[in-house]
Amino acid sequence: IWELKKDVYVVELDWYPDAPGEMVVLTCDTPEEDGITWTLDQSSEVLGSGKTLTIQVKEFGDAGQYTCHKGGEVLSHSLLLLHKKEDGIWSTDILKDQKEPKNKTFLRCEAKNYSGRFTCWWLTTISTDLTFSVKSSRGSSDPQGVTCGAATLSAERVRGDNKEYEYSVECQEDSACPAAEESLPIEVMVDAVHKLKYENYTSSFFIRDIIKPDPPKNLQLKPLKNSRQVEVSWEYPDTWSTPHSYFSLTFCVQVQGKSKREKKDRVFTDKTSATVICRKNASISVRAQDRYYSSSWSEWASVPCS
Amino acid sequence: RNLPVATPDPGMFPCLHHSQNLLRAVSNMLQKARQTLEFYPCTSEEIDHEDITKDKTSTVEACLPLELTKNESCLNSRETSFITNGSCLASRKTSFMMALCLSSIYEDLKMYQVEFKTMNAKLLMDPKRQIFLDQNMLAVIDELMQALNFNSETVPQKSSLEEPDFYKTKIKLCILLHAFRIRAVTIDRVMSYLNAS
């Protein structure tokens, strides 16, 4: 058993049918010695008396808010949560496996640049009695500071019969140098509590591996005289790291017909312009990627050919 | 990435082309190592990230873009020792910091070259003959060093009398390649920045 926060405790249980559970001793936070009784949640049934209460915690029915009273007055509370260990592996009931980029990915994180700011998000089908708390650091043995905000509900989607809820959090490394070569990964830890169930999820990454630039901005077409060709031009996104001559991007320009089946023409360039043939009803799209370290491509920025 | 590559015109900053070749070569070598050594811990998540140049060179600090010198987090350990400029610089444009930056890059390359050559000698003794260093990568390191043209003491190749532990050598190869790829990215950024300046 360990303390999650003041008056909230997590009991770790080896979770299998007929398991013996864990013996837990609760102590009433009071100078009083006599006439103390204990109850669980809203029930008035007295579970025991005395300054300490010994309980055998086996199932969720044994978890909850234990209260010690004296003469009708509440003295203190202890909330017991359960953390299930199923065959040597901590349970992951609360969050959905996003399966991207690999199986058992519960937290996904992205950064728009090298400033040390990043966003993580996760999915759940649970809509109520759910709280999250996020901590982060650079490295784990001698951790350096990363400050995270509060997790917020960022999207709701309908998937088949289920509603899916997306939560996200923004974090910022306290003293980040965009040019630094990372040798210690960022660690992100999310505590999730649903009703009386506690779970924790972690992700470990280098900022360089989670970079996904914003799409190029100011995408424009300039028709070339007496030709079906157009000059496409664009600019680096505002959110990208500067100077751009150091933090360079590479670009992919795509000409896509109206039908998805039509052949796509693609050109790769390090410049911020390209000359392409603009077909009728086609659209031109451009996306960006770090020129030197192949992390994710940005989303496409698009303009119609007409 | 197998993308079309524009060849730099002769008037360009001479080292940019070499540094691009270097990044391509080390990335290819790392990919090959990860595939060949699939039963070894060779992914970024599995290895310890060690930098053999730590406390010996200070490339990131010495080559910091001017715009980032205002960022206190980037200014932990700026080097101040003076080193003669190399041939990548048009001499009139030579600045003290630029010379320092390029000499630091040269020292990095020299250290990695020695490590890779020592390692290759061990890998050639492996009865499994599982993996060797790409000669193209070693050649590209050499080319960039020559382009930088710094006069520096030659570091003798390390020789070891004891029987090599091939498992450990292959893991060390992965660690070295990961670190060298990160350094090659920094070198490429620096060359691109200097070229634009």
């Epitope: 299998y16 260990k85 199923e86 040597g88 089908t125 | 039963f39």
Partner: antibody, heavy 115, light 112 residues
């Protein structure tokens, strides 16, 4: 004490369907994940499928994906395996099993797929 | 499709020490715990070892398990006639959990 009693096995022709049941008692069935494991005659153990305690997630072996469906009725304390498009290579003793460091197995039920 | 490899058979005379190996990889045994089962003819498997080296109550202390790196082993010190059975190791793969990975199985024969 924990008990898992299986039923529903038998002889069936290739291409036909069969449903296996596993009735649980002696524990809070709705709190635990459950597996199906099979063993072809004279062969080793092969995992077939898993279902979470609340039925929200199901996992299958590639060899049965799209043909077998694992389900549970927590109000009846029963686990099911619906098997469709059966093949000769599905012939085996099928076991249900609880998920956890200490597990409990059903007695097994024989499924024979033969024309 | 078995990823955990066991010797097909091992044998010993009563009182001898018998060991069964179970060889896997970094994504399974290397990053998960190992169980061992005993299966007597015509019966369901019985748990002998969980969590690499833990014995459930009721399992004789002549059975012991260990794990090192990407392989595990089961030892029977002072093998007895009633130990003649098939033995299976089981683990998980970190990418496909909770799918169970079973070993190929080992037939233990007690001679004499």
């Amino acid at each position: 004490q924990v008990q898992l009693v299986q039923s529903g096995g038998g002889v069936v022709q290739p291409g036909r369907s069969l449903r296996l049941s596993c009735a649980a008692s002696g524990f809070t069935f709705s709190s635990y994940g459950m597996h199906w494991v099979r063993q072809a005659p004279g062969k080793g153990l092969e995992w077939v499928a898993f279902i979470r305690y609340d039925g929200s997630n199901k996992y299958y072996a590639d060899s049965v994906k799209g043909r077998f469906t694992i389900s549970r009725d927590n109000s009846k304390n029963t686990l099911y395996l619906q098997m469709k498009s059966l093949r000769a290579e599905d012939t085996a003793v099928y076991y249900c099993k609880t998920h956890g460091s200490h597990d409990n197995w059903g007695q097994g039920t024989m499924v024979t797929v033969s024309s | 499709s078995y990823v955990l490899t066991q010797p097909p058979s091992v044998s010993g005379t009563p009182g001898q020490r018998v060991t069964i190996s179970c060889s896997g990889g970094r994504s399974n045994i290397g990053s998960s715990t190992v169980k061992w089962y005993q299966q007597l003819p015509g019966t369901a498997p019985k748990l002998l070892i969980y969590g690499n080296d833990q014995r459930p109550s009721g399992v004789p202390d002549r059975f012991s398990g260990s794990k090192s790196g990407t392989s595990a082993s089961l030892a029977i010190t002072g093998v007895q006639a009633e130990d003649e059975a098939d033995y299976y190791c089981q683990s998980y793969d970190r990418g496909t959990h909770p799918a169970l990975l079973f070993g190929t199985g080992t037939k233990v024969t007690v001679l004499g």
